[in-house]
Amino acid sequence: EPPTACREKQYLINSQCCSLCQPGQKLVSDCTEFTETECLPCGESEFLDTWNRETRCHQHKYCDPNLGLRVQQKGTSETDTICTCEEGLHCTSESCESCVPHRSCLPGFGVKQIATGVSDTICEPCPVGFFSNVSSAFEKCRPWTSCETKDLVVQQAGTNKTDVVCGPQDRQRA
């Protein structure tokens, strides 16, 4: 009685269960009643990452420097190359096919989370008592200067974009 289903890591062909090729190898010829499945290792710059019956290996991904990409992890016969972005850039998608510059946080906003090769800068508004007077992809909101600790008084209140202006005690307004 010919089988209708095969075990794990096998496939059904010509009413017969043949072994799948292991990751890193491609199928050359199906098994027969008398011979095992014939598999061959993938060539340089090729891979197959599953037990398979593919007759061709996949090409490793190319990390195109013109798109701001670089190799994060070199591919093997069983794994694809992983690309990431050059410094100052991050991927536009999960598959990281191209890169765009990290955004800067505008004045009045600080960096909540610094960008990585795969995620953009996350900005947050500076709350009262903090400020940012620069456009930056790295700077957090900074606290206003405490005039009191310098034996000075506030001459001009801070904003989310400017620090407090301190001055001598005697210049206190009446």
Partner: antibody, heavy 122, light 113 residues
Amino acid sequence: QVQLVQSGAEVKKPGSSVKVSCKASGYTFSTSWIEWIRQAPGQGLEWMGSILPGSGSTNYAQKFQGRVTITADTSTSTAYMELSSLRSEDTAVYYCARGDDGSYVRWYFDHWGQGTLVTVSS
Amino acid sequence: DIQMTQSPSSVSASVGDRVTITCRASQSLLFSVNQKNYLAWYQQKPGKAPKLLIYWASSLQSGVPSRFSGSGSGTDFTLTISSLQPEDFATYYCQHYYSYPWTFGQGTKVEIK
């Protein structure tokens, strides 16, 4: 102890101005923000603006910009809120409250004046 | 401007009941640098000025009974009265102080059932 005492009730005609005072005691007036909040009859609280008396620095809610002026006199520890071009919708209780004290960590309003009722009616 | 939305607008409850009031901000009030939520809760009785109950979303103001508590982070906050007392029937307001202009929720009136 901290106290904020406001001026008495006022009845005003539409188009006129009102000036409400808030006399502070029990803390360093010049280094703490004074906030002004109003409440129309049966309505919620609405922030109008604030002043840091020592520097004269002010912040105003956009809604009142150009119609409200907040000032302070450090010699008498008194803050003032003047509202011009009054209309009937300005009928409300006006409160002053103490905000941050220069520590930059106490922006909430921990002490309030008793409120001043301003009635705008022709 | 940051909008503050309170719910419910009123609640009927009996003495001893647990009462929960919620407040939602239109943007996060949590600042990553100091991990503080810039939110306060006030109680107001008819004809009186508001009184500060809670600041930094969960810190109890000095002199306020411990049956009052605040919780939440980011955009969603709660004021809880664990066992309602006769003197707690009042209107409650949340307020953010993250950035100007400060804004208040529309208020929640706690009434006697």
